[in-house]
Amino acid sequence: KKEDGESTAPTPRPKILRCKCHHHCPEDSVNNICSTDGYCFTMIEEDDSGMPVVTSGCLGLEGSDFQCRDTPIPHQRRSIECCTERNECNKDLHPTLPPLKNRDFVDGPIHHK
């Protein structure tokens, strides 16, 4: 939240943004870096073995607002964070898995930080 009198002007960002990519790298990417006119993202999700897999990459400007909104999907634990403030800003993103539903436990929920 901005304090009174503090400028709300957005920080100018690079027209073309470079992002770290992993498992979402286009074929022409070099050194796990992709380029976009949109956003960098980092996502954590359960894979098909229950592993908390982290992937990252570039999102084009078109539709990225929706993709970065992180709408909950039933029966899928997934969280995404996006950034635009500087090149490779997604290196510092730290999305966390949404908590398990209580019905997954028979002896009450386990507390997660």
Epitope: H22, H23, E46, G50, V53, T55, T96, L97, F105
Partner: antibody
């Protein structure tokens, strides 16, 4: 809380098979994946494979495909691993581990000794 | 298969010290790495997932860092109960593979 109970030890003869069990409690058995890991003294840890208790779907380490068979018994919330054609190389501690994203609980381990 | 190398088999430390256990992957695994602690006669206990996320209940003196091929588990203010074996594991691709472990001993 989430717990995985395994028998302490199994003594088996070379060439025989053994079925190891892993009884889960404290959570809904079908909502976590069950992994199996082998540990030999001085040889580190090896991932054998995993099973989805809900669908019964499995994924194996190629190295253990002809050695291990993973199954589940949903009514008793028990995962099992059958090891076949046992040799001294199979003497080890075998762990089951229940995984779900940011939860990772290991069983107590079963020591398998292959000896005539 | 991806090879996880823990080059230091043993590390000596004193209570109160800060110690860093390292692990190197043979190819890029992003941040898809677990760290485990194992005490003699016990099963492994998960400390860290996704290279830097602490499991619930793990003391905050345990910190994971790194990405790509180089990973570090740092224990600040080492306690006597931290003397154990520490293993890294990659889960970026199958088969899942472990490092050979680093034994933390009292100097």
């Amino acid at each position: 809380q989430v717990q995985l109970q395994q028998p302490g030890a199994e003594l088996v003869k070379p060439g025989a098979s053994v079925k190891l069990s892993c009884k889960a409690s404290g959570y809904t058995f079908t909502t976590y994946w069950m992994h199996w890991v082998k540990q030999r003294p001085g040889r580190g840890l090896e991932w054998i494979g995993r099973i989805d208790p809900n669908s019964g779907g499995t994924k194996y380490n190629e190295k253990f495909k002809s050695k291990a068979t993973l199954t589940v018994d949903k009514p008793s919330s028990t995962a099992c691993m059958q090891l076949s054609s046992l040799t001294s190389e199979d003497s080890a501690v075998y762990y089951c581990a229940s995984r779900r994203g940011d939860i990772d609980v290991w069983g107590t381990g079963t020591t398998v000794t292959v000896s005539s | 298969d991806i090879v996880m190398t823990q080059s230091q088999k043993f590390m000596s430390t004193s209570v109160g010290d800060r110690v860093s256990v390292t692990c190197k992957a043979s190819q890029n695994v992003g941040t898809n790495v677990f760290w485990y602690q194992q005490k003699p006669g016990q099963s492994p206990k998960a400390l860290i997932y996704a290279a830097s996320y602490r499991y619930s209940g793990v003391p905050d003196r345990f910190t994971g860092s790194g990405s790509g091929t180089d990973f570090t588990l740092t224990i600040s203010n080492v306690q006597s109960e931290d003397l154990a074996d520490y293993f890294c594991q990659q889960y970026d691709s199958y088969p899942l593979t472990f490092g050979d472990g680093t034994k933390l001993e009292l100097r």
